[in-house]
């Protein structure tokens, strides 16, 4: 066959769907690879062809669109399963072509099983709610296009295994779940089950997401450097190991990049000739506030090193701060015999 622009296996779009539920999968060509949409392609005389490779097989085969009750069908650039079966798992390819043009991409589709409490190997999206922030809501995701607006589905929300009913601060409102107050106790997995009729059959869509309650932007502060501080002096003799921790607290801020770095005499450690190593550790509070510690280490410090300026810097979306460490050379204890001798005028 003639040459075809092959975008390969698009593993970035690992699609997971639940067994025995409807699934609509758009051909990724139009979403991520081509500069035109399906309508333009169709009106230009291009045809969209679907085929697949079963799990643990190498053979590409056409998709059977003649199954009972049209279990698998294609509509424009969408491949429909009504519903999926476990053995639909595999790599699916959509190819757009005519006599002079060809472009194709493959993507993995995994049909997963869930238990009665909605546990499954499905990768869950995370929705962050601000702690004690006021009314916030989550919306049942990825249900658009499954039924027309004239169809009124029933939606049931669950937290973990339990149906949300008289949950005090959590109120189901159709496709939305409203949190009157978001508390740490609201952390967990929330599932919406959308039930709708189609051609005399009833279908269910199950969507689970993880809610994580995080620090409120109203409480956010610039980075706070706990160490170094004015109370600790790093007093060393030449040849000893110098260890200076820089410990910084960062309030949680959505999409903020938290940075900590050291400068030695105003330069980054990489730009200086001394043998310095820096080790970083990060810990998080329950509301995702972050504490970063960078330990600056010089194995065998010289008297020159002890005269340098060591400054810890921190930056977040809330601001930038810096703090110098107090480093000094330890004054050796007087050697008694010599001092005594000097005292008597001996040479």
């Amino acid at each position: 066959s003639e040459r075809c622009d092959d975008w390969g296996l698009d593993t970035m779009r690992q699609i997971q769907v639940f067994e025995d539920e409807p699934a609509r999968i758009k051909c990724p060509l139009f979403e991520h690879f081509l500069k035109f949409n399906y309508s333009t392609a169709h009106s230009a005389g291009l045809t969209l062809i679907w085929y697949w490779t079963r799990q643990d097989r190498d053979l590409e085969e056409p998709i059977n669109f003649r199954l009972p009750e049209n279990r698998i069908s294609k509509e424009k650039d969408v491949l429909w399963f009504r519903p999926t079966l476990l053995n639909d798992t595999g790599n699916y390819t959509c190819m757009l072509r005519n006599t002079t043009y060809c472009s194709k991409v493959a993507f993995p589709l995994e049909v997963v099983q869930k238990d009665s409490c909605f546990n499954s190997p499905m990768k869950l999206p995370v929705h962050k709610l601000y702690i004690e922030y006021g009314i916030q809501r989550i919306t049942c995701p990825n249900v658009d296009g499954y039924f027309p607006s004239s169809v009124k589905p029933t939606i049931t929300w669950y937290m973990g295994c339990y149906k949300i009913q008289n949950f005090n601060n959590v109120i189901p409102e159709g496709m939305n779940l409203s949190f009157l107050i978001a508390l740490i106790s609201n952390n967990g997995n929330y599932t919406c089950v959308v039930t709708y009729p189609e051609n005399g059959r009833t279908f269910h869509l199950t969507r689970t997401l993880t809610v994580k309650v995080v620090g409120s932007p109203k409480n956010a502060v610039p980075p706070v450097i706990h160490s170094p501080n004015d109370h600790v002096v790093y007093e060393k003799e030449p040849g000893e190991e110098l260890l200076i921790p820089c410990t910084v607290y960062f309030s949680f801020l959505m999409d903020s990049r938290n940075e900590v770095w050291w400068t030695i005499d105003g330069k980054k450690p990489d730009d200086i000739t001394i043998d310095v190593t820096i080790n970083e550790s990060i810990s998080h509070s329950r509301t995702e506030d972050e504490t970063r510690t960078q330990i600056l280490s010089i194995k065998k410090v010289t008297s020159e090193d002890l005269k340098r300026s060591y400054v810890c810097h921190a930056r977040s979306a809330k601001g930038e701060v810096a703090k110098a460490a107090k480093v000094k050379q330890k004054v050796p204890a007087p050697r008694y015999t010599v001092e005594l001798a000097c005292g008597f005028g001996a040479t």
Epitope: E132, Y133, G134, N168, N169, G174
Partner: antibody, heavy 119, light 110 residues
Framework: SLEESGGDLVKPGASLTLTCTAS?????????MCWVRQAPGKGLEWIAC????????TYYASWAKGRFTISKTSSTTVTLQMTSLTAADTATYFC?????????????WGPGTLVTVSS | AIEMTQTPSSVSAAVGGTVTINCQAS??????LAWYQQKPGQRPKLLIY???LLASGVPSRFKGNGSGTEYTLTISDLESADAATYYC????????????FGGGTEVVVK
């Protein structure tokens, strides 16, 4: 309990600030504080609510936006600032507490304060 | 904005009787509905919240029901102390958060 104050007889076009003071409890992240009014012989009308937590998120009836401002001034007081008052604003103004940990129930109301707008 | 329509505007019944008050929301309010009792010159008193939950200290003669856009308050075994105006109140938290009250129903006990 809740107690409203600041109600007065004012002229059209004037401004007025009402205060709601809580006693026996202090505003916490569990509560929303709201203002509702009732014109003489008429029904209840929601004006605005404020979240008592640190964010102080505010919620207004569409007709109240711009002319009414709800604020939390301390851990036990909420105010309602009203501007460009007209005779239609003559009413008893109630302060109410909404319990966010109890399905949003409006469980505590003040006795109300009367605002009269007349020339 | 949500609108709450309450019917009837007035209802009369004998002591020991039953009255039913209806409240219709202009959109689905998902059981975010409360009922209040107000006597002349007094503050409103919460009776029912979340459509059917009885507020603390309220006798079980008061019963709330309904879902979606249609809700009812039923008062059985009427007592003379039940003479008051009753208001429904709906809330919507998703989208633009708002609350709205019905126009009120006057209950006269004969």
């Amino acid at each position: 309990s809740l107690e409203e104050s600041g109600g007065d007889l004012v002229k059209p076009g004037a401004s007025l600030t009402l205060t709601c003071t809580a006693s026996g409890f202090s505003f916490s992240s569990t509560y929303y504080m709201c203002w509702v009014r009732q014109a003489p012989g008429k029904g209840l009308e929601w004006i605005a609510c404020i979240y008592a937590g640190s964010s102080g998120s505010t919620y207004y009836a569409s007709w109240a936006k711009g002319r009414f401002t709800i604020s939390k001034t301390s851990s036990t007081t909420v105010t309602l600032q009203m501007t460009s008052l007209t005779a239609a604003d003559t009413a008893t103004y109630f302060c109410a507490r909404v319990d966010g940990s109890s399905s949003g129930s409006w469980d505590l109301w003040g006795p109300g304060t009367l605002v009269t707008v007349s020339s | 904005a949500i609108e709450m329509t309450q019917t009837p505007s007035s209802v009369s019944a004998a002591v020991g009787g039953t009255v039913t008050i209806n409240c219709q929301a202009s959109q689905n309010i998902y059981s975010n509905l409360a009922w209040y009792q107000q006597k002349p010159g007094q503050r409103p008193k919460l009776l029912i919240y979340a459509a059917s939950l009885l507020a603390s200290g309220v006798p079980s003669r008061f019963k709330g029901n309904g879902s979606g856009t249609e809700y009812t308050l039923t008062i059985s075994d009427l007592e003379s102390a039940d003479a008051a105006t009753y208001y429904c109140q709906g809330a919507v938290y998703s989208g633009n958060t708002e609350w709205a009250f019905g126009g009120g129903t006057e209950v006269v006990v004969k």
